[in-house]
Interface confidence: medium
Protein backbone atom coordinates (compact mmCIF):
# COMPACT_ATOMS: atom_id res chain seq x y z
CA UNK A 1 0.00 0.00 0.00
CA UNK A 2 1.56 3.24 -1.06
CA UNK A 3 0.55 6.61 0.24
CA UNK A 4 1.10 10.16 -0.83
CA UNK A 5 3.70 12.26 0.92
CA UNK A 6 2.78 14.25 3.97
CA UNK A 7 3.60 17.92 3.82
CA UNK A 8 3.70 18.66 7.50
CA UNK A 9 5.81 20.98 9.57
CA UNK A 10 5.67 18.67 12.56
CA UNK A 11 8.72 16.56 13.23
CA UNK A 12 7.73 15.45 16.66
CA UNK A 13 8.46 11.81 16.16
CA UNK A 14 11.77 10.01 16.20
CA UNK A 15 12.31 6.80 14.33
CA UNK A 16 13.16 3.84 16.52
CA UNK A 17 13.28 1.44 13.60
CA UNK A 18 15.40 1.05 10.51
CA UNK A 19 14.87 3.18 7.41
CA UNK A 20 13.23 0.20 5.72
CA UNK A 21 10.75 -0.36 8.54
CA UNK A 22 9.72 3.23 9.07
CA UNK A 23 6.86 4.59 7.03
CA UNK A 24 8.07 8.15 6.81
CA UNK A 25 10.08 11.13 7.94
CA UNK A 26 8.20 14.15 9.17
CA UNK A 27 9.78 17.45 8.15
CA UNK A 28 11.77 18.92 10.97
CA UNK A 29 10.63 22.09 12.66
CA UNK A 30 12.77 22.64 15.71
CA UNK A 31 10.66 25.52 16.93
CA UNK A 32 7.58 23.36 17.12
CA UNK A 33 8.68 20.22 18.86
CA UNK A 34 11.35 18.99 21.17
CA UNK A 35 14.49 17.42 19.87
CA UNK A 36 15.43 13.87 20.76
CA UNK A 37 16.85 15.18 24.01
CA UNK A 38 13.44 16.51 24.97
CA UNK A 39 14.18 20.23 24.89
CA UNK A 40 12.61 22.92 22.75
CA UNK A 41 9.63 25.20 22.60
CA UNK A 42 6.15 24.18 21.47
CA UNK A 43 5.20 27.04 19.23
CA UNK A 44 3.77 27.26 15.77
CA UNK A 45 5.86 28.40 12.84
CA UNK A 46 4.35 29.88 9.74
CA UNK A 47 6.81 28.65 7.11
CA UNK A 48 7.09 24.91 7.32
CA UNK A 49 9.97 23.02 5.86
CA UNK A 50 8.98 20.62 3.12
CA UNK A 51 11.56 17.89 3.46
CA UNK A 52 9.67 14.64 3.11
CA UNK A 53 11.87 11.79 2.00
CA UNK A 54 9.62 8.74 2.23
CA UNK A 55 5.93 8.08 1.60
CA UNK A 56 3.63 9.21 4.38
CA UNK A 57 -0.10 9.08 4.90
CA UNK A 58 -2.32 11.86 3.74
CA UNK A 59 -6.08 11.97 4.03
CA UNK A 60 -8.02 14.00 1.58
CA UNK A 61 -8.66 17.20 3.43
CA UNK A 62 -7.88 19.76 0.81
CA UNK A 63 -8.87 23.16 -0.34
CA UNK A 64 -11.43 23.23 -3.14
CA UNK A 65 -9.90 22.18 -6.43
CA UNK A 66 -11.29 23.06 -9.86
CA UNK A 67 -13.69 20.37 -11.05
CA UNK A 68 -12.18 18.13 -13.66
CA UNK A 69 -13.32 14.98 -15.42
CA UNK A 70 -11.50 12.51 -13.23
CA UNK A 71 -12.19 9.92 -10.61
CA UNK A 72 -9.42 11.03 -8.32
CA UNK A 73 -8.91 13.98 -6.05
CA UNK A 74 -5.68 15.85 -6.54
CA UNK A 75 -4.49 17.15 -3.22
CA UNK A 76 -3.54 20.79 -3.45
CA UNK A 77 -1.30 22.39 -0.91
CA UNK A 78 -1.54 26.03 0.06
CA UNK A 79 2.23 25.99 0.53
CA UNK A 80 3.98 26.96 -2.75
CA UNK A 81 4.24 23.86 -4.88
CA UNK A 82 7.56 22.21 -5.44
CA UNK A 83 8.55 20.84 -8.83
CA UNK A 84 7.49 17.23 -8.94
CA UNK A 85 8.36 14.38 -11.24
CA UNK A 86 5.45 12.56 -12.94
CA UNK A 87 5.91 9.76 -10.44
CA UNK A 88 5.66 12.16 -7.51
CA UNK A 89 2.63 13.85 -9.03
CA UNK A 90 0.89 10.52 -9.34
CA UNK A 91 1.46 9.87 -5.64
CA UNK A 92 -0.63 12.94 -4.84
CA UNK A 93 -3.85 11.33 -6.09
CA UNK A 94 -6.23 10.06 -3.46
CA UNK A 95 -9.00 7.61 -4.22
CA UNK A 96 -12.37 7.70 -2.53
CA UNK A 97 -15.23 5.27 -2.34
CA UNK A 98 -18.88 5.82 -3.05
CA UNK A 99 -19.63 5.06 0.57
CA UNK A 100 -17.60 8.08 1.63
CA UNK A 101 -19.91 10.28 -0.43
CA UNK A 102 -22.93 9.43 1.71
CA UNK A 103 -22.71 12.73 3.54
CA UNK A 104 -25.19 15.31 4.70
CA UNK A 105 -26.79 17.15 1.75
CA UNK A 106 -25.07 20.35 2.86
CA UNK A 107 -21.73 18.71 2.20
CA UNK A 108 -22.55 17.34 -1.22
CA UNK A 109 -20.97 20.29 -2.96
CA UNK A 110 -17.52 19.50 -1.66
CA UNK A 111 -15.08 18.64 -4.39
CA UNK A 112 -14.65 14.93 -3.92
CA UNK A 113 -14.47 12.44 -6.75
CA UNK A 114 -15.18 8.78 -6.33
CA UNK A 115 -13.68 5.64 -7.72
CA UNK A 116 -15.57 2.38 -7.46
CA UNK A 117 -12.73 0.02 -6.58
CA UNK A 118 -11.29 2.13 -3.78
CA UNK A 119 -12.73 1.49 -0.37
CA UNK A 120 -11.99 4.39 1.88
CA UNK A 121 -11.23 7.98 2.65
CA UNK A 122 -7.85 7.25 4.19
CA UNK A 123 -6.79 4.48 1.85
CA UNK A 124 -4.05 5.27 -0.63
CA UNK A 125 -3.40 3.93 -4.09
CA UNK A 126 -2.65 0.23 -3.74
Amino acid sequence: ESRAELTSDKDMYLDNSSIEEASGVYPIDDDDYASASGSGADEDVESPELTTSRPLPKILLTSAAPKVETTTLNIQNKIPAQTKSPEETDKEKVHLSDSERKMDPAEEDTNVYTEKHSDSLFKRTE
Epitope: L6, K10, D44, P57, L61, S63, K123
Partner: antibody, heavy 123, light 107 residues
Amino acid sequence: EVQLVETGGGVVQPGRSLTLSCGASEFTFSNYAMHWVRQAPGKGLEWVAVISYDGTKKYYGDSVKGRFTISRENIKNTLYLQMNSLRSEDTAVYYCARDVGKGVTATGTFDIWGQGTMVTVSS
Amino acid sequence: AIRMTQSPSSLSASVGDRVTITCRASQGIGSYLAWFQQKPGEAPKSLIIDATRLKSGVPSRFSGSGSGTEFALTISSLRPEDFATYYCQQYNVSPLTFGGGTKVEIK
Protein backbone atom coordinates in the same frame (compact mmCIF):
# COMPACT_ATOMS: atom_id res chain seq x y z
CA GLU B 1 1.74 26.24 25.53
CA VAL B 2 -0.32 24.73 22.74
CA GLN B 3 -3.76 24.14 24.19
CA LEU B 4 -7.25 22.93 23.31
CA VAL B 5 -10.15 23.57 25.69
CA GLU B 6 -13.56 21.96 25.18
CA THR B 7 -16.74 23.50 26.57
CA GLY B 8 -20.48 22.98 26.22
CA GLY B 9 -20.93 19.58 27.80
CA GLY B 10 -23.74 18.81 30.19
CA VAL B 11 -26.84 16.72 30.76
CA VAL B 12 -29.34 16.56 27.92
CA GLN B 13 -32.45 14.50 27.25
CA PRO B 14 -32.57 11.91 24.47
CA GLY B 15 -33.61 13.40 21.16
CA ARG B 16 -32.40 16.86 22.07
CA SER B 17 -29.43 18.80 20.72
CA LEU B 18 -26.19 20.14 22.14
CA THR B 19 -23.25 22.03 20.68
CA LEU B 20 -19.70 21.56 21.91
CA SER B 21 -16.95 24.10 21.37
CA CYS B 22 -13.19 23.72 21.38
CA GLY B 23 -11.00 26.77 21.76
CA ALA B 24 -7.45 26.63 20.46
CA SER B 25 -4.52 28.70 21.57
CA GLU B 26 -0.79 29.10 20.97
CA PHE B 27 -0.79 27.62 17.47
CA THR B 28 -2.12 28.66 14.10
CA PHE B 29 -5.48 26.94 14.30
CA SER B 30 -6.35 27.65 10.66
CA ASN B 31 -3.43 25.48 9.51
CA TYR B 32 -4.66 22.21 10.98
CA ALA B 33 -7.30 19.61 10.37
CA MET B 34 -9.17 18.98 13.62
CA HIS B 35 -10.94 15.95 15.05
CA TRP B 36 -13.49 15.05 17.69
CA VAL B 37 -12.90 11.80 19.58
CA ARG B 38 -15.14 10.49 22.36
CA GLN B 39 -14.89 8.06 25.23
CA ALA B 40 -17.90 6.52 26.95
CA PRO B 41 -17.52 6.05 30.72
CA GLY B 42 -15.18 3.15 31.41
CA LYS B 43 -14.84 2.41 27.70
CA GLY B 44 -12.31 2.95 24.94
CA LEU B 45 -11.78 5.72 22.43
CA GLU B 46 -14.03 6.29 19.42
CA TRP B 47 -13.32 8.66 16.55
CA VAL B 48 -16.26 10.95 15.81
CA ALA B 49 -15.40 13.38 13.02
CA VAL B 50 -12.70 15.34 11.23
CA ILE B 51 -12.73 18.70 9.45
CA SER B 52 -10.16 20.11 7.07
CA TYR B 53 -8.10 23.16 7.97
CA ASP B 54 -10.43 25.43 6.00
CA GLY B 55 -13.69 23.70 6.85
CA THR B 56 -14.42 22.54 3.32
CA LYS B 57 -14.14 18.82 4.02
CA LYS B 58 -15.91 16.95 6.80
CA TYR B 59 -16.08 13.24 7.54
CA TYR B 60 -17.86 11.34 10.27
CA GLY B 61 -17.79 8.06 12.12
CA ASP B 62 -20.60 5.67 11.24
CA SER B 63 -22.37 5.99 14.58
CA VAL B 64 -22.86 9.76 14.27
CA LYS B 65 -23.37 10.25 10.52
CA GLY B 66 -26.46 12.31 9.79
CA ARG B 67 -26.81 13.44 13.42
CA PHE B 68 -23.59 15.28 14.22
CA THR B 69 -22.04 18.19 12.33
CA ILE B 70 -18.46 19.33 12.73
CA SER B 71 -17.60 22.94 11.87
CA ARG B 72 -15.02 25.58 12.64
CA GLU B 73 -14.54 29.33 12.82
CA ASN B 74 -10.89 29.98 12.11
CA ILE B 75 -11.20 33.66 12.92
CA LYS B 76 -12.27 32.65 16.43
CA ASN B 77 -9.83 29.73 16.71
CA THR B 78 -12.80 27.54 17.55
CA LEU B 79 -13.97 24.07 16.57
CA TYR B 80 -17.58 22.98 17.02
CA LEU B 81 -19.58 19.78 17.22
CA GLN B 82 -23.33 20.18 16.75
CA MET B 83 -25.00 17.06 18.13
CA ASN B 84 -28.62 16.41 17.17
CA SER B 85 -31.02 13.56 17.98
CA LEU B 86 -28.87 12.58 20.93
CA ARG B 87 -29.05 9.03 22.24
CA SER B 88 -28.03 7.45 25.52
CA GLU B 89 -25.12 5.80 23.73
CA ASP B 90 -23.73 9.24 22.92
CA THR B 91 -22.94 9.69 26.62
CA ALA B 92 -19.18 10.21 26.73
CA VAL B 93 -16.31 12.55 27.32
CA TYR B 94 -15.74 14.42 24.06
CA TYR B 95 -12.20 15.43 23.17
CA CYS B 96 -11.10 17.71 20.40
CA ALA B 97 -7.74 16.79 18.95
CA ARG B 98 -5.36 18.37 16.48
CA ASP B 99 -4.21 16.35 13.50
CA VAL B 100 -0.50 15.70 13.17
CA GLY B 101 -0.47 17.10 9.64
CA LYS B 102 -0.44 20.77 8.74
CA GLY B 103 -2.08 22.67 5.92
CA VAL B 104 -4.19 20.73 3.45
CA THR B 105 -2.65 17.52 4.65
CA ALA B 106 -4.08 15.49 7.49
CA THR B 107 -2.69 12.18 8.63
CA GLY B 108 -5.66 10.82 10.52
CA THR B 109 -3.89 10.67 13.85
CA PHE B 110 -3.53 13.18 16.64
CA ASP B 111 -0.86 15.06 18.56
CA ILE B 112 -2.60 17.61 20.79
CA TRP B 113 -5.73 16.75 22.79
CA GLY B 114 -8.04 18.85 24.91
CA GLN B 115 -9.00 17.85 28.43
CA GLY B 116 -12.47 16.76 27.31
CA THR B 117 -16.02 17.77 28.15
CA MET B 118 -18.62 15.35 29.51
CA VAL B 119 -21.92 14.87 27.71
CA THR B 120 -24.61 12.88 29.50
CA VAL B 121 -27.73 11.89 27.58
CA SER B 122 -30.37 10.84 30.04
CA SER B 123 -34.07 11.29 30.64
CA ALA C 1 -14.48 -0.72 9.45
CA ILE C 2 -11.11 -2.16 10.40
CA ARG C 3 -11.20 -3.84 13.79
CA MET C 4 -8.22 -3.28 16.04
CA THR C 5 -7.73 -6.00 18.65
CA GLN C 6 -5.40 -5.35 21.55
CA SER C 7 -4.05 -8.00 23.85
CA PRO C 8 -3.97 -8.48 26.66
CA SER C 9 -6.86 -6.30 27.83
CA SER C 10 -5.04 -5.87 31.12
CA LEU C 11 -1.78 -6.96 32.69
CA SER C 12 -0.05 -6.71 36.03
CA ALA C 13 3.64 -5.90 36.10
CA SER C 14 6.30 -4.59 38.41
CA VAL C 15 8.59 -1.61 38.12
CA GLY C 16 11.55 -2.62 35.97
CA ASP C 17 9.64 -5.26 34.01
CA ARG C 18 9.69 -5.43 30.25
CA VAL C 19 6.14 -5.16 28.94
CA THR C 20 4.82 -5.83 25.45
CA ILE C 21 1.32 -4.98 24.25
CA THR C 22 0.13 -6.28 20.92
CA CYS C 23 -2.35 -4.84 18.46
CA ARG C 24 -3.81 -6.75 15.54
CA ALA C 25 -5.64 -5.16 12.60
CA SER C 26 -8.42 -7.07 10.86
CA GLN C 27 -6.79 -6.17 7.54
CA GLY C 28 -3.46 -4.75 6.47
CA ILE C 29 -2.85 -1.12 7.40
CA GLY C 30 0.77 -0.76 6.33
CA SER C 31 2.57 1.16 9.06
CA TYR C 32 -0.26 3.59 9.72
CA LEU C 33 -0.63 2.85 13.39
CA ALA C 34 -0.36 5.11 16.43
CA TRP C 35 -0.06 4.37 20.15
CA PHE C 36 -1.53 6.50 22.93
CA GLN C 37 -1.19 6.46 26.69
CA GLN C 38 -4.08 7.50 28.92
CA LYS C 39 -4.11 7.92 32.67
CA PRO C 40 -7.33 8.09 34.71
CA GLY C 41 -9.07 11.45 34.38
CA GLU C 42 -6.67 12.65 31.69
CA ALA C 43 -6.73 12.99 27.94
CA PRO C 44 -4.81 10.49 25.82
CA LYS C 45 -1.20 11.32 25.07
CA SER C 46 0.52 10.51 21.78
CA LEU C 47 3.49 8.15 22.07
CA ILE C 48 4.17 6.74 18.63
CA ILE C 49 2.97 7.18 15.05
CA ASP C 50 3.76 5.28 11.86
CA ALA C 51 4.14 2.17 14.02
CA THR C 52 7.70 3.00 15.07
CA ARG C 53 8.16 6.75 15.33
CA LEU C 54 8.51 7.98 18.90
CA LYS C 55 7.19 11.41 19.77
CA SER C 56 9.83 13.83 20.96
CA GLY C 57 9.90 13.96 24.74
CA VAL C 58 8.59 10.42 25.12
CA PRO C 59 11.15 8.27 26.95
CA SER C 60 13.18 5.92 24.79
CA ARG C 61 12.07 2.96 26.88
CA PHE C 62 8.93 3.06 24.71
CA SER C 63 9.25 1.50 21.29
CA GLY C 64 6.91 0.39 18.55
CA SER C 65 7.23 -2.34 15.98
CA GLY C 66 5.29 -4.15 13.32
CA SER C 67 3.54 -3.51 10.03
CA GLY C 68 0.64 -4.92 8.07
CA THR C 69 -1.65 -6.49 10.65
CA GLU C 70 0.59 -7.20 13.66
CA PHE C 71 1.98 -4.45 15.87
CA ALA C 72 3.53 -4.16 19.30
CA LEU C 73 4.29 -1.51 21.87
CA THR C 74 7.16 -2.39 24.19
CA ILE C 75 8.18 -0.69 27.42
CA SER C 76 11.69 -1.91 28.07
CA SER C 77 11.79 -1.16 31.79
CA LEU C 78 8.53 -0.16 33.42
CA ARG C 79 8.52 3.00 35.53
CA PRO C 80 5.88 4.02 38.10
CA GLU C 81 4.54 6.69 35.76
CA ASP C 82 3.94 4.12 33.01
CA PHE C 83 1.01 2.49 34.77
CA ALA C 84 -1.85 3.56 32.51
CA THR C 85 -4.08 2.36 29.70
CA TYR C 86 -2.58 2.11 26.21
CA TYR C 87 -4.50 2.31 22.94
CA CYS C 88 -3.52 1.60 19.37
CA GLN C 89 -5.17 3.46 16.48
CA GLN C 90 -5.13 2.79 12.76
CA TYR C 91 -5.26 5.67 10.31
CA ASN C 92 -4.90 3.88 7.01
CA VAL C 93 -8.61 3.54 6.39
CA SER C 94 -11.69 5.55 7.27
CA PRO C 95 -13.30 5.35 9.72
CA LEU C 96 -10.38 5.77 12.08
CA THR C 97 -10.51 3.04 14.68
CA PHE C 98 -8.89 2.33 18.05
CA GLY C 99 -8.06 -0.85 19.85
CA GLY C 100 -9.99 -1.65 23.00
CA GLY C 101 -7.11 -0.65 25.25
CA THR C 102 -4.65 -2.43 27.52
CA LYS C 103 -4.57 -1.48 31.17
CA VAL C 104 -1.12 -1.84 32.73
CA GLU C 105 -1.48 -2.24 36.48
CA ILE C 106 0.95 -2.54 39.35
CA LYS C 107 1.54 -6.10 40.48
